[in-house]
Interface confidence: low
């Protein structure tokens, strides 16, 4: 007699989470009689999953009516695929006795779950930093199968090339995992930039989801700083300034000090913002000439973002100031930064 | 580097039939999706539609179903467009052009292009 | 079907102009827009997708922006080898379509 083939004609079968799976599988023979039962997993580890006789199995159905007279179709289908169905599912053949003995196994079918990513979070660094500095960038995506899936990294619209990326795990798994860290050269003009991590994947079927990272967050760009006097007044008051300017974030803290006395401290707010994301503020103090007897040694003093302070002194000469109108004077630094360092 | 390298032109009699080639190099065929753009003389581009390279399954815009048939021969990396029952009408360059992201087996925007090929329909 | 039209259909320039093609969308599309440059006899070359996006290779001075239903190219300043016709084309909804194109000749 010829002998009992068990046939399962997919080596494969990929299949979305969600969705329901059919895993093929005839038999060549009626005979000798013995149930069909599907395990996932070869060897004594195997797990049974579907068995006619006994046992509850929600999740799976026949596709055929096995218990239909000369039935040869021992196909079932599993609904609601999650990424842990996974695995080599075969259909095994047994001959009836007590117990029933295994007889033939069909090779097997993989079953492959394609489950999409989750949407990409992109995290910036902890602390803010200045231009010409590298800061970096980690954009993580979870839950995908199968393994290949690509990452790319763009900055306003310019793909990054600093990038490093792992899937993990390394080996076989239900589902996977990628990080991926993108090195940023920040410039000044970065406060409206944008970084966008892009994953593309087998489940997307469409645009590749993105996520989002302003630079706006991790960027500080310090202030330049000018003092300058304006002409004297009729009422013996002249006029300095001190123009803080090309400053992110906003945080910003001036005080005056007349030779060396904190005169007035101001906080900046609600300041308008420069086409380029960057703030401006000029301060203004008063000096009534006619009150000091030498010159008067003013300093504009600037804490931004939680640094160091910046300072930038004028001198204020009280002898070369008679009752007439001077004109504009810049400041003579005197300070210890004529400007910041970038 | 990547490619995709269209068959020469061809001439053909109304009522004949003509395969297309485009054959894909540098990249692994199966993981973009393939689309056919017509473009008749001095005319603009128009969506014919995409095979899907993972699972073969085509997508045809509504004026190409019927004499339009896009197919595939993964083992040459090569997507075919066929068009049976040739009309005057259908005399056109046709390109190949692949949709831009990895595994991404949609229509979508186009990243290579093939270098096109003239059919013309005349008798 | 997504309509899609773009102005003008004709556009003279000078080297180192700056030229501003916009093209519009009969539906909002979101961000699904992409832009394409062809020459005479050659096949259409990408240039930006997903409206702002440049492809790698494709010069600084192309830029796209627009969300919704209406979209701009911009050449910042026009070189000899960018007269040609640009095509848009929308694939937020099937089936895909492209616009019948802006000619740029030289002035």
């Known amino acids: 007699e010829e002998e009992l083939q068990v046939i399962q004609p997919e080596k494969s079968v990929s299949v979305a989470a969600g969705d329901s799976a059919t895993l093929n599988c005839t038999v060549s023979s009626l005979i000798p009689v013995g149930p069909i039962q599907w395990f996932r997993g070869a060897g004594p580890g195997r797990e049974l999953i579907y068995n006619l006789k006994e046992g509850h199995f929600p999740r799976v159905t026949p596709v055929s009516d096995p218990t239909k007279r000369n039935n040869m179709d021992f196909s079932i289908r599993i609904s609601n695929i999650t990424p842990a169905d996974a695995g080599t599912y075969y259909c095994v053949k047994f001959r009836k006795g007590s117990p029933d003995v295994e007889l033939k196994s069909g090779a097997g079918t993989e079953l492959s779950v394609r489950a999409k990513p989750s949407a990409p979070v992109v995290s910036g660094p902890a602390v803010r930093a200045t231009a010409e500095h590298t800061v970096s960038f980690t954009c993580e995506s979870h839950g995908f199968s199968p393994r290949d899936i690509t990452l790319k990294w763009f900055k306003n619209g310019n793909e990054l090339s600093d990038v490093q990326t792992n899937v993990d795990p390394a080996g076989k798994s239900v589902s996977y995992s990628i990080r991926s860290t993108a090195r940023v050269v920040l410039t000044r003009r970065d406060v409206h930039s944008q970084v966008i991590c892009e994953v593309a994947h087998v489940t997307l079927q469409g645009d590749p989801l993105r996520g989002t990272a302003n630079l706006s967050e991790a960027i500080r760009v310090p202030p330049f700083l000018e003092v300058t006097q304006q002409s004297m007044r009729a009422d013996n008051q002249v006029n300095v300034t001190c123009q803080v300017t090309k400053f992110y974030p906003q945080r910003l803290q001036l005080t005056w000090l007349e030779n060396g006395n904190v005169s007035r401290t101001e906080m900046a707010s609600a300041l308008p913002e420069n086409k380029d994301g960057t703030y401006n503020w000029t301060s203004w103090l008063l000096v009534n000439v006619s009150a000091h007897r030498d010159d008067v040694k003013l300093t504009c003093q600037v804490e931004h973002d939680g640094q160091p302070a910046v300072n930038k002194s004028f001198s204020v000469k009280v002898s070369a100031h008679p009752k007439e109108q001077g004109s504009n004077t810049a400041a003579e630094n005197t300070g210890t930064n004529e400007r910041n360092i970038y | 580097q990547i490619q995709l390298v269209q068959s020469g032109s061809e001439l053909k009699k109304p009522g004949a039939s003509v395969k297309v080639s485009c054959k894909a190099s540098?990249?692994?065929?199966?993981?973009?999706?393939m689309n056919w753009v017509r473009q008749a003389p001095g005319q603009g581009l128009e969506w014919m539609g995409f095979?899907?390279?993972?699972?073969?399954?085509?997508t045809y815009a509504q004026g190409f179903k019927g004499r339009f048939v896009f197919s595939l021969d993964t083992s040459v990396s090569t997507a075919y467009l066929q068009i049976s029952s040739l009309k005057a009408e259908d005399t056109a360059v046709y390109y190949c052009?692949?949709?831009?992201?990895?595994?991404?087996?949609?229509?979508?925007?186009?990243?290579?292009w093939g270098q096109g090929t003239l059919v013309t329909v005349s008798s | 079907d997504i309509q899609m039209t773009q102005s003008p259909s004709r556009l003279g320039a000078s080297v180192g102009d700056r030229v501003t093609i916009t093209c519009r969308a009969s539906?909002?599309?979101?961000?699904?827009l992409a832009w394409y440059q062809q020459k005479p006899g050659k096949a259409p070359k990408s240039l930006i997708y997903?409206?702002?996006y440049r492809y790698i290779g494709v010069p600084s001075r192309f830029s796209g922006s627009g969300s919704g239903t209406d979209f701009t190219l911009t050449i910042s300043s026009l070189q000899p080898e960018d007269f040609a016709t640009y095509f848009c084309?929308?694939?937020?909804?099937?089936?895909?379509t492209f616009d019948q194109g802006t000619k740029l000749e030289i002035k």
């Open positions: 052009a692949r949709t831009r992201g990895y595994y991404d087996f949609d229509g979508g925007a186009f990243d290579y």
């Open positions: 540098g990249y692994s065929i199966t993981n973009y999706a």
């Open positions: 095979i899907n390279t993972y699972t073969g399954e085509p």
């Open positions: 539906q909002n599309v979101g961000t699904h």
């Open positions: 997903s409206a702002i």
């Open positions: 084309q929308q694939y937020n909804t099937y089936p895909l």
